[in-house]
């Protein structure tokens, strides 16, 4: 856990530019406030400076959490975690950010989706997601609806389905009705990961019933 008392970093790009180029957990400061949050910084992938906002890798953390937990974040930045919608919303409304989603299946394959523009609306607007400029190897159609879906949790139903997607598919996500992805679904181990409607799904890469082995969502300023 790295922190210099004199340094205030808004994101991992600022950490990187300050000379800290080692992967690890760093203390970040909310924009326009003194509130702090711990995040994992990837200082190696694609030039470094990536703030990890989500990671799934082993099923050790329960992702069926409340609205408040998704708001403030949960889990362990060194393992499975959700950084927190409020921090990400505030950060991505300060300047233009890119979002990279890195995926691993159980057969040793990896893929990614990169969005050249990403921001989350405020809590008042249910942390609605906005995405543009899709490239990458995980599908030429976006598996997160780019329409600007609201975030939903088990106690905050903002999806476009008469059902409650978060309760049915588990996890908080930008559900449509219910849509082609959910990286916060149930973690299924190998050989139990197929034909699972409520797993970790990225439809336009692996189809509807395939639950992924590992996922990482990371953001970085577009002008890094």
């Amino acid at each position: 856990d790295y922190k210099d008392d004199d340094d205030k970093f808004r994101d991992c790009a600022e950490v990187f530019k300050s000379g800290h180029t080692t992967n690890g957990i760093y203390t970040l400061t909310f924009p326009n406030s003194t509130e702090e949050i711990k995040a994992y910084c990837d200082m190696e992938a694609g030039g470094g400076g990536w703030t990890i906002i989500q990671r799934r890798e082993d099923g050790s953390v329960d992702f069926q959490r409340t609205w408040k937990e998704y708001k403030v974040g949960f889990g362990n930045p060194s393992g499975e975690y959700w950084l927190g919608n409020e921090f990400v919303s505030q950060l991505t409304n300060q300047q233009r950010y890119v979002l990279k989603i890195h995926l691993k299946d159980w057969e040793g394959n990896e893929a990614y989706s990169l969005y050249e523009h990403f921001y989350l609306s405020s809590e008042e607007l249910n942390y609605r997601i906005h995405l543009k400029g899709l490239t990458g190897t995980a599908g030429k159609i976006s598996s997160i609806s780019q329409a600007g879906n609201d975030f939903s949790t088990k106690d905050g139903d903002n999806d476009k389905c008469i059902c409650k997607c978060s309760q049915m598919l588990t996890g908080g996500w930008w559900f449509d009705a219910c849509g082609p992805s959910n990286l916060n679904g149930m973690y299924y181990p190998q050989r139990q990961n197929t034909n699972k409607f409520n797993g970790i799904k990225w439809y336009y890469w692996k189809g509807s019933g395939y639950s992924l082995k590992a996922t990482t969502m990371m953001i970085r300023p577009a002008d890094f």
Epitope: N93, R96, E116, H117, Y119, S121, S122, E124, L125, R128, H130, K132, G133, L134, T135, K140, I141, S142, Q146, A147, G148
Partner: antibody, heavy 121, light 107 residues
Framework: DVQLQESGPGLVKPSQSLSLTCTVT?????????WNWIRQFPGNKLEWMGY???????SYNPSLKSRISITRDTSKNQFFLQLNSVTPEDTATYYC??????????????WGQGTSVTVSS | SIVMTQTPKLLLVSAGDRVTITCKAS??????VAWYQQKPGQSPKLLIY???NRYTGVPDRFTGSGYGTDFTFAISTVQAEDLAIYFC?????????FGGGTKLEIK
């Protein structure tokens, strides 16, 4: 429901400034999204002119950058277009529209009905 | 600026026909392409966004596809009320640019 309504003079003299107002109802222009001006020339060609985002930042078409200004009055939920040094080539129907992304250009889901502007002496 | 070349300029069709309109971008537009319908005397209406997503309330006879530089818009079964001009628009890079339009006329 979100509604946009353009208003302004239908006739402007060459070399003068064109000023239009877009009044938005059903959604606060400071909540989210970008608020655009688009024009359609005789013959139906469409041209994006610029936007003001919910945060107040602006983006303009480089072809107009020296002549255009988009501002807003948040208390009235209105945004404005000013186009300076107009010529007859600026004769068009002017639309205001909301785009589906707040920090960059995007598709536009709500449009006003348009207001016709003729530049002539 | 990305130039959007839209073809054809005019489509003369009968009710019940299937029609296809294409737009070619001068450079990659990812999937950031929208399609609009403009009926006579009205403002444009959004039909398709992000290349293939149907906007709320748009009938499923309207579809869009494509990625990169080549985009297609189709009406599976043309109806009389589809008489309009159809425009494509890229918003991958600023400034956003429109195709020249395709006028759909019913025989």
């Amino acid at each position: 429901d979100v509604q946009l309504q353009e208003s302004g003079p239908g006739l402007v003299k060459p070399s003068q400034s064109l000023s239009l107002t877009c009044t938005v109802t059903g959604y606060s222009i400071t909540s989210d999204y970008a608020w655009n001006w688009i024009r359609q020339f005789p013959g139906n060609k469409l041209e994006w002119m610029g936007y003001i985002s919910y945060s107040g930042s602006t983006s303009y078409n480089p072809s107009l950058k020296s002549r255009i200004s988009i501002t807003r009055d948040t208390s009235k939920n209105q945004f404005f277009l000013q186009l300076n040094s107009v010529t007859p080539e600026d004769t068009a129907t002017y639309y205001c529209a909301r785009s589906t992304f707040g920090h960059y250009v995007s598709s536009m889901d709500y449009w006003g009905q348009g207001t016709s502007v003729t530049v002539s002496s | 600026s990305i130039v959007m070349t839209q073809t054809p300029k005019l489509l003369l069709v009968s009710a019940g026909d299937r029609v296809t309109i294409t737009c070619k971008a001068s450079q990659s537009a990812s999937n950031d392409v929208a399609w609009y319908q403009q009926k006579p005397g009205q403002s444009p209406k959004l039909l398709i966004y992000y290349a293939s997503n149907r906007y709320t309330g748009v009938p499923d006879r309207f579809t869009g596809s494509g990625y990169g530089t080549d985009f297609t818009f189709a009406i599976s079964t043309v109806q009389a009320e589809d008489l309009a001009i159809y425009f494509c628009q890229q918003d991958y890079s600023s400034p956003p640019t429109f195709g020249g339009g395709t006028k759909l006329e019913i025989k």
